[in-house]
Every structure is written in C-alpha cells, then in structure tokens.
C-alpha cells in the first residue's frame, strides 16, 4: 500500500530574470527513492538517479542546474516559464509518487517601476 | 579525444568467471557514469549496469543483478566488469560506454570484448 | 520493464530515398530517447539523443521525433554507407533498454 505524501512549495512567483528552486519531498514513507524525474507539462527538464546521477535534457541544460538534494534550480527566468511542473518519485517498492508546482514568472519590479512613471 | 579501450577476447568454462577492463582515457574518470552493454550474436542490446565513480552509486538490470559486479579503480581511469556462473546464454560482445555531461545518452563507446563460453 | 519495440526488423530502401524507422515505448518514457547506428563489425555510434537533437558530427539528413510513447528516426536522403542496424533506447527508468533493431538495407 501507497502511504507516501509528497509536500512541494505548491504555487510560486518569481521574477523575470531570476531564479528559483523547485523542491518536492517524499515522506510518510519507508520507501527507496531510486529516481526523481522533473518535467513541465509534457517535456523532461532532468532526472535525477540515485546511482547514476544527473541527466538534464539538452533544451534547458544552459539554464538548470542539479539540485539542491533532489530539487532543481531553474534560473535566467522568463515568461514563457510560468506553467506546471511535475516532481515523479519513483520509489521501491511502492512505486511512483508525484508532485505538482505552479510557478508564475512576472515582469520585475524594476520593468514595472519604469513603466509606471515613465516620461511622456 | 575521449577512448574506452576495452580488454581482449576471453574464452571460459561453464561455471567459470570473467572479469573484463575498460580504461578510459581523453576525459576525468570520474564525473562520467560507466555502463556495460550486452550484445548475444545477431541480437540487440541489453544494459546491464551502471557505476557512477563518483559516488560509488552502482545501478543493475535485476537480470544480471546476482551474477555481475560492477567495480572501478580511479587511480588507472578503469572500470571493470565481473560476470561469474556462466553459461552458453553469457557467449556475447560485452560493450562500456558512457555519456557526457550531465546526459544519460551513450556517446561513447569502447571497442568490445568478445566472450565465449564453452566446455 | 519498459520494452521498446521496433516493428521492422527490416527494411530496404534505395539511395537517396526518405525512410523512417519507428519505435513504441510500452509506457511513457517522456523524451529521454536515443538512436544509434550499428555497422557490421563495429560498436554502436550515438546519432541523435533527447530525441530530436543531432550528435556531434553526424550528418543533418539523420533526423529524430517523438515524445511520450511514440518516436520515429528518420534519414531524409539514404546514402550506401547507411546501410547498417538502427536502435532506439530509453532511459527514463531502469532497467534502461533497447528496442530490438531495425536492419536497413540497400537496394
């Protein structure tokens, strides 16, 4: 039986141009975690193996870094970003837990501080 | 240039063990993952295992779990491969290979080893 | 097990035609696919990874799709040094696999 619950930050916001960390953990359970897989709506970012380590799919390799732990760092932020992320724990001998994040990139407050007292 | 250089043929028992090297060279041993690919005459590939160097971290395909072991010497860049038991079944090229940074893909590959199991 | 299957052992193509080779995944392994090119004699060569991006090296007519279950390998414009055994590999769980080979041969 499944007994696991899987705790992420849940809905998050960062700035265009930033960075953030997207975390998930696995608890209530005494299942191995032999893999985490990381993905956004039908696309792979990284996999993180127990063993084997880090893979992180070439189209976000120069803008994701591994970790930290099991999480993963998605950084030079930009609107097209924002959507729904995935944690997939696959554990043994329960089998696969997953977790949802939402993540909304926003224009800085710089850009926005600029835009509203702008000079005619 | 990165080069596995895998050791020669071996011709073996039935029962017997094998243990075969490969050295890598042209890149640091130990941020890179060594697998071991299985190829029986004619037929496809089967992974069997992977080492990560770096963390000791050893992943098996359960079907060769009991029988092979997966080891390296970082000092000489050497991954090695046991396969004890053998049967006619293990008769096969015998393949390392490994990715490149941070991908899962096998970009490299050594030469092969041949191994024959027969009385 | 994840098993990939390739559903043409064979196919025979001539020079400069467009032949796709495909690959099912038994269950859903995202992106996380490679293809490899074997030649009679020799080790297998990385052409495309992740699944649609080109190797160092390997020539532009070497084409690669899919995500999710289905993924195809495509060569736009065959040439006779083509001539060899396509794999398809996953490895988005272990035990990662391999499909079982497609055999291209020339006319």
């Known amino acids: 039986m499944m007994t696991g619950t899987i705790e992420t930050t849940g809905n998050i916001s960062a700035e265009k141009g930033g960075s953030i960390i997207l975390q998930c953990h696995l608890s209530s359970t005494t299942a191995q975690v032999t893999q985490v897989n990381w993905e956004q709506q039908d696309q792979l970012l990284a996999i993180c193996n127990a063993d084997l380590g880090w893979h992180i799919s070439p189209s976000f390799k120069d803008r994701v870094a591994p970790g930290p732990g099991l999480g993963l760092t998605l950084q030079s932020l930009t609107v097209n970003d924002t959507g729904e992320y995935f944690c997939i724990y696959h554990t043994y001998p329960d089998g696969t837990y997953t977790g949802r994040i939402f993540l909304e990139v926003l224009e800085s407050s710089v850009a926005e501080h600029g835009a509203r007292f702008q000079i005619p | 240039e990165v080069q596995l250089q895998q050791s020669g043929p071996e011709l073996v028992k039935p029962g017997a063990s094998v243990k075969i090297s490969c050295k890598t060279s042209?890149?640091?041993?130990?941020?890179?993952?060594m697998h071991w690919v299985k190829q029986s005459h004619g037929k496809s590939l089967e992974w069997i295992g992977g080492?990560?160097?770096?963390?000791?971290?050893?992943s098996y395909n359960q079907r060769f779990k009991d029988r092979a072991t997966l080891t390296v010497d970082k000092s000489s860049s050497t991954a090695y491969m046991e396969l004890r038991s053998l049967t006619s079944e293990d008769s096969a090229v015998y393949y390392c290979?490994?990715?490149?940074?941070?991908?899962?893909?096998?970009?490299?590959w050594g030469q092969g080893t041949l191994v024959t199991v027969s009385a | 097990d994840i098993v990939m299957t390739q559903s043409h052992k064979f196919m025979s193509t001539s020079v400069g035609d467009r032949v796709s080779i495909t690959c099912k995944a038994s269950?859903?392994?995202?992106?996380?696919v490679a293809w490899y090119q074997q030649k009679p004699g020799q080790s297998p060569k990385l052409l495309i990874y992740?699944?649609?991006y080109r190797y160092t090296g390997v020539p532009d007519r070497f084409t690669g799709s899919g995500s999710g279950t289905d993924f195809t390998f495509t060569i736009s414009s065959v040439q006779a040094e083509d001539l060899a055994v396509y794999y398809c590999?996953?490895?988005?769980?272990?035990?990662?696999?391999f499909g079982g080979g497609t055999k291209l041969e020339i006319k």
């Open positions: 290979t490994r990715g490149t940074y941070y991908d899962y893909s096998f970009a490299y």
């Open positions: 042209g890149s640091t041993f130990t941020e890179y993952t």
């Open positions: 080492l990560n160097p770096n963390n000791g971290g050893t």
């Open positions: 269950h859903y392994v995202s992106t996380a």
């Open positions: 992740s699944p649609s």
């Open positions: 590999h996953q490895h988005y769980s272990t035990p990662w696999t």
